[in-house]
């Protein structure tokens, strides 16, 4: 059986302080312990929670913790449940409140000789003791002009007189602590000869050229005087009006009327009431000229169907604050529904494609009206008008792949070739409607293409394979002029490609057949040993069934390739002497010789007096200078081949002969003696 070792007991507690209701049980089986408050299970919160089997209070609350607490233990195995005795808190607390007028019903009814009762709304447990104050000074209980009822928390003034006027406050204390009134009461018992406000002027906002009215009334015995004054202290009367208030009228009841208001009339107006005795009462009211600023324009907005979207109206500043509303197709939007207005916001709870259009935000006040349109586009996922198709494109011609889609807004189309983005260049162009143009189709354009059409709402894609229909062409085209070396083996290749593999063959241009030492092996012309007779015009013919035939004409020249009879040697020359660089070449056709010195070709027509190239090809340089030093290249060329050979030229100072060097001494360099 379940036994309580410790049961919760009733106890004193302080509002907002810690407390603990103890409960300890003993049972043979595991026991589930929970708490009831007034018979209802207690849920754990940060403030009040189970701590083991006890109930802990971080901060006692007089409202939430009043009542009977019970500790309940339940044996999970046997189903037995027992409850502790009830325990409750005696919660001590004190709470501040205002001083309020209990009698008469309103301040307006307070007159001299009236009985006035004030109540102190400080409450607590145990019942607090109260102390009243006027202007911070404690009121004693023994004065004949007032009575204090602690039980009722009341202060009664009988009868009220002007001497009772002042700020009334109260404080109270009990076992918990002390509190003072949260809001005090100002008692004003008027002297009848003092001016009192009956009607105070209010701030006014008017549009230019409209009229403005200020009301003002005082009362006193005898009746008080009333005067209106504008900002600069200029009095306003029907007899003497300041120049800028020519259209002002003061009525007998104290109201001030301003007609056809201008900006200079805006400002503070003071209504001054003066009784027979007492200070003047000055009441202020401001005349504002209505104004409204311009509205900022909207950026066009693109939204995705199905989303919740909001557009905030850039409401203009204005006086009075402009009222703002949204319209669509000239109809104001409702406060509720799928599309509605909430404050300054245009709200689409779930935006739909049909919501595309122009929405207008209006702002209006006395000064006028402003409006701004916002263009709202609800993006849709593109749909196909024409997908790219697998295509056969002809080599060398323009090729087109279509990717026609429609959506809102206009979709953007990008193309991929072999998974690589196609950037527009001289060969590829993407038109506005998404069509890809390949300006001149090449063989390697035969691959997989993919187009992606997108809007903010999503994208679609499709792919197509391009097969290139090859031109019948020579690959590469044979050189129209070619040379063969006399008495040597030579080959002249000719190959072609097309939609079908073409047959390639050689013929002589004059129609005569190839000699037996010349063979045509699948387009390669082979000369076992070139003779002079092999020179001439030859035609390579490539043909296949679907494309016909193509021809390439080649002129073959038989030549003796160039060799050097004499090559220039490494030469050292004294400055001022003449250098001779010899070079002779032979070949058929007879080679021409050119020289290159210091990395530029020496033009025979522009050599000047110091340099000369002989008929046999040798180069002579007179009066050599150090800057002539360098590498010289002899280039021999004819229509069939070109060869070159080079040698360095070094120009040195002539040495001064020393005594030790007799005529028999060898020169320091191998010289050309000139």
């Amino acid at each position: 059986a379940i036994v309580f070792i410790k049961e919760p007991s009733s106890q004193d507690a302080l509002q907002g302080r810690r407390a603990l209701l103890r409960c300890e049980v003993e049972a043979p089986d595991p026991v589930h312990v929970y708490w009831l408050l007034n018979g209802v299970p207690v849920q754990d919160t940060e403030r009040r929670f189970a701590q083991g089997s006890s109930l802990s209070f971080a901060a006692v609350d007089r409202l939430q913790d009043s009542g009977a607490f019970q500790c309940v233990a339940r044996d999970n195995v046997t189903g037995e449940e027992v409850r502790s005795t009830n325990a409750s808190f005696n919660i001590k607390w004190i709470e501040a409140g205002p001083v309020v007028l209990k009698h008469p019903a309103s301040e307006a009814e307070i007159q001299p000789q009236t009985q006035v009762t004030l109540r102190c709304h400080i409450d607590g447990h145990p019942r607090p003791t109260y102390q009243w104050f006027r202007d911070g000074t404690p009121l004693s209980d023994d004065q004949s002009t007032h009575t204090v009822s602690s039980r009722e928390r009341n202060l009664t003034l009988r009868p009220a007189s002007p001497e009772h006027s002042g700020l009334y406050s109260c404080c109270a204390h009990n076992a918990f602590g002390q509190a003072c009134s949260s809001q005090n009461f100002t008692l004003s018992v008027a002297d009848e000869s003092f001016a009192r406000v009956v009607l105070a002027p209010q701030d006014v906002v008017v549009a230019r050229n409209e009229e403005a009215m200020f009301h003002c009334q005082f009362s006193a015995q005898p009746p008080p005087s009333l005067q209106w004054v504008f900002e600069d202290e200029t009095p306003i009367t029907n007899r003497s009006r300041p120049p800028h208030l020519r259209r002002a009228v003061v009525f007998a009841n104290g109201s001030l009327l301003l007609t056809q208001v201008r900006p200079r009339n805006a400002g503070v107006y003071r209504c001054i009431g003066q009784g027979q005795r007492g200070p003047p009462i000055v009441l202020e009211a401001t005349l504002h000229l209505a104004e409204i600023e311009d509205m900022l324009p909207f950026e066009p907005r693109v939204f995705i169907a199905g989303d919740e979207e909001r557009v905030t109206c850039p409401a203009p500043q204005g006086l009075p604050t402009p009222s703002v509303w949204w319209e669509h197709a000239g109809v104001p939007l409702p406060a509720h529904g799928r599309v509605h207005q909430k404050g300054l916001e245009l709200v689409f709870v779930t935006i739909a494609e049909s919501d595309t259009g122009v929405y207008t935000c209006h702002a209006s006040n006395l000064a006028g009206q402003r409006r701004q349109d916002v263009n709202i586009t609800v993006a849709t996922v593109p749909t196909w008008l024409r997908k790219p198709q697998d295509s056969q494109l002809e080599e060398g011609k323009p090729g087109y792949l279509h990717c026609l889609t429609q959506a809102t807004p206009k979709p953007t189309v990008i193309w991929y070739r072999n998974q690589m983005l196609i950037s527009e260049d001289s060969r590829f162009e993407v038109s506005k409607n998404g069509t890809l143009r390949i300006n001149s189709v090449e063989v390697y354009d035969g691959t997989l293409y993919r187009c992606v059409s997108s809007t903010p709402a999503g994208s679609i894609e499709a792919q197509a394979r391009v097969q290139v229909l090859e031109k019948l062409k020579f690959t590469p085209p044979p050189q129209p002029q070619q040379c063969m070396e006399f008495d040597k083996e030579a080959t002249v290749p000719c190959s072609a490609t097309g939609r079908e593999k073409p047959t390639v063959k050689w013929v002589r241009a004059d129609g005569s057949s190839l000699p037996e030492w010349v063979t045509d092996n699948a387009g390669t012309l082979h000369f076992a040993r070139v003779t002079r007779d092999d020179a001439g015009n030859y035609t390579c013919i490539a043909s296949n069934e679907p494309q016909g035939q193509i021809r390439a004409h080649v002129q073959l020249t038989v030549a003796v390739f160039i060799t050097f009879k004499v090559e220039p040697e490494r030469t050292t020359v004294y400055q001022g002497h003449t250098a001779l660089l010899r070079c002779e070449a032979q070949g058929d056709p007879k080679p021409l010789i050119q020289w290159k010195g210091k990395d530029r070709i020496l033009d025979p027509t522009k050599l000047g007096p110091r340099m000369h190239i002989f008929q046999n090809g040798s180069l002579v340089i007179h009066d050599v200078a150090p800057e002539d030093s360098g590498s010289y290249t002899c280039i021999a060329g004819n229509s069939c081949n070109i060869r070159h050979t080079e040698a360095p030229l070094l120009v040195v100072d002539k040495p001064v002969m020393e005594d030790s060097e007799g005529p028999g001494s060898p020169p320091p360099y191998k010289m050309i003696q000139t």
């Epitope: 089986d29 595991p30 026991v31 589930h32 312990v33 083991g52 089997s53 339940r74 044996d75 999970n76 195995v77 046997t78 189903g79 037995e80 449940e81 027992v82």
Partner: antibody, heavy 113, light 111 residues
Framework: QVQMQQSGAELMKPGASVKLSCKAT????????IEWVKQRPGHGLEWIGE????????NSNEKFKGKATFTADTSSNTAYMQLSSLTTEDSAIYYC??????WGQGTLVTVSA | DIVLTQSPASLAVSLGQRATISCRAS??????????MHWYQQKPGQPPKLLIY???NLGSGVPARFSGSGSGTDFSLNIHPVEEDDSAMYFC?????????FGGGSRLEIK
């Protein structure tokens, strides 16, 4: 010793109500929770709810709210479970148990048109 | 609701060997220092019988061959050595929260 004696088998029409009883002996009836469990072939065991006879307090499975109502008569030490708006889905063996240890023999309810 | 997942759904164990059944809870069933997880055995035509209560406590009159372990969300029932009479359905149940929920059951067969 603790015993839980349940009422006999019931054959009911769809839409009808049935009240099952569970008589407890051998312990203080008011201080122990009585639990009700449903068993359908191939559906395992389902906890329907429980009642503490002394206070009349009960807890039930949300799934059976509106289907099962628990009461107890302390004078006869008997707990009751009423099943309303019967359907073929309610065909099952219903057990009562005091805690986890002492189970009744079960009552077979068959709902058939 | 706390969901209890039992595994395996069925097992066949040779006489004298060990049988282990697992039960996993969708959230912790620990409270007041106890694990409120219990194990039952049920044979055809009979009501369930309490084997283990509060995860590891042996029920009244239950042989010591049965043992339970685990805390929080993972629990297991062990039978060793298995006897012919142990052929039955086994269920786990949590009583931490209303509704008290049962596992789907595990059928033990003796080979």
């Amino acid at each position: 010793q603790v015993q839980m004696q349940q009422s006999g088998a019931e054959l009911m029409k769809p839409g009808a109500s049935v009240k099952l009883s569970c008589k407890a002996t051998g312990y203080t009836f008011t201080g122990y929770w009585i639990e009700w469990v449903k068993q359908r072939p191939g559906h395992g065991l389902e906890w329907i709810g429980e009642i503490l006879p002394g206070s009349g307090r009960s807890n039930s499975n949300e799934k059976f709210k509106g289907k099962a109502t628990f009461t107890a008569d302390t004078s006869s030490n008997t707990a009751y479970m009423q099943l309303s708006s019967l359907t073929t889905e309610d065909s099952a063996i219903y057990y009562c148990a005091r805690g986890k240890l002492s189970w009744g023999q079960g009552t077979l309810v068959t709902v058939s048109a | 609701d706390i969901v209890l997942t039992q595994s395996p759904a069925s097992l066949a164990v040779s006489l004298g060997q060990r049988a282990t059944i697992s039960c996993r809870a969708s959230e912790s069933v620990d409270s007041f220092g106890n694990s409120f997880m219990h194990w039952y055995q049920q044979k055809p035509g009979q009501p369930p019988k309490l084997l283990i209560y509060a995860a590891s406590n042996l029920g009244s009159g239950v042989p010591a061959r049965f043992s339970g372990s685990g805390s929080g969300t993972d629990f297991s029932l062990n039978i060793h050595p298995v006897e012919e009479d142990d052929s039955a359905m086994y269920f786990c149940q949590q009583s931490k929260e209303v509704p008290r929920t049962f596992g789907g059951g595990s059928r033990l067969e003796i080979k």
